[in-house]
């Protein structure tokens, strides 16, 4: 199998993001800088590397972005929390994938992830987290394009 199944409701995640997108992007103080947006690296990922890159980007959001953001308002926090929980569930799915040796990380995949981390590190932590949250739709669109998404009830 070249692709691993992501068994989660992507539509629900996209809805949650759309509800907070404007509020998040309004806080972006570096509109001309991008972390994921113009990533040709994401566009040229080979099918063989999709699982690895997905796994790495989920970890990037869960371990860095969702922990570094400094949003104090419950209205936004509830949505971020909902997205984070969905990402944790997706990580669990991909872990099973790894156990079946279907999520090998080749150098190209590792390089693509490193570019994203490097972009993130070039900004102050709060600014980087806000920007990455604001670019969540780039990652979600990429997942939709590259995975056979099975909607779970």
């Amino acid at each position: 199998l070249r692709r691993c199944l992501i068994s989660t409701d992507m539509h629900h995640i996209e809805e949650s993001f759309q509800e907070i997108k404007r509020a998040i992007q309004a806080k972006d103080t570096f509109p001309n800088v991008t972390i994921l947006s113009t990533l040709e690296t994401l566009q040229i990922i080979k099918p063989l590397d999709v699982c690895c890159v997905t796994k790495n980007l989920l970890a990037f959001y869960v371990d860095r972005v969702f922990k570094d953001h400094q949003e104090p308002n419950p209205k936004i926090l509830r949505k971020i929390s909902s997205i984070a929980n969905s990402f944790l569930y997706m990580q669990k799915t991909l872990r099973q994938c790894q156990e079946q040796r279907q999520c090998h990380c080749r150098q190209e995949a590792t390089n693509a992830t490193r570019v994203i981390h490097d972009n993130y590190d070039q900004l102050e932590v709060h600014a980087a987290a806000i920007k990455s949250l604001g670019e969540l739709d780039v990652f979600l669109a990429w997942i939709n394009k590259n995975h056979e998404v099975m909607f779970s009830a």
Epitope: P72, N73, P74, K75, S81
Partner: antibody
Framework: EVQLQQSGPVLVKPGASVKMSCKAS????????VGWVKQSHGKSLEWIGY????????RCNQKFKGKATLTVDKSSSTAYMELNSLTSEDSAVYYC????????????WGQGTLVTVSA | DIVMTQSPSSLAMSVGQKVTMSCKSS????????????LAWYQQKPGQSPKLLVY???TRPPGVPDRFIGSGSGSDFTLTISSVQAEDLADYFC?????????FGAGTKLELK
Amino acid sequence: EVQLQQSGPVLVKPGASVKMSCKASGYKFTDYFVGWVKQSHGKSLEWIGYVDPENGYTRCNQKFKGKATLTVDKSSSTAYMELNSLTSEDSAVYYCARYDYDWAWFTNWGQGTLVTVSA
Amino acid sequence: DIVMTQSPSSLAMSVGQKVTMSCKSSQSLLSSYNQKNYLAWYQQKPGQSPKLLVYFASTRPPGVPDRFIGSGSGSDFTLTISSVQAEDLADYFCQQHERLPITFGAGTKLELK
């Protein structure tokens, strides 16, 4: 009527820990974040952190990381804060406060718990 | 962290006088998302817990007398008491909720002459 009832004053020795409670009533406990705020001897207010009673998720001010632990018991609509390795700097009144539903201002406050750290 | 600076630290007024106190933030609290200023004011009477007086810089919650007027935008805010009453003797704190950590000003103590 929304009420936040906090536990009584405590006198503790340096190095000890203390766990204080904040019992909520008059609203659906899981719908509103609970924040904790420190006030040292009549001085200004310091935000310690919040807990989302719905899922127990917490976020603390970096200054209180390793000092404060926030938890909730949904069944009794009670939020807790534990402070460890106490020093005289931790002597203060600690308030729990209910957030607005959407925004991070505090619409209701407990009466405060006075913590005195003394040998 | 966003630093909140209040002035004066104390002031003494007579009943019926107009009072103004200032709160300045080290960064703008105006959100381009909803054009709201993420600033609240609290009143703390002696021996009591703080009480919310104003949110979004100028909106009073139900039950707060209309003599309390919040104004300002960006990083410069003012709380005005149009005609001070004896029961207004208290400390007044401003608070930002634009980003974590939430921070408060050091307070303005209102005393009566």
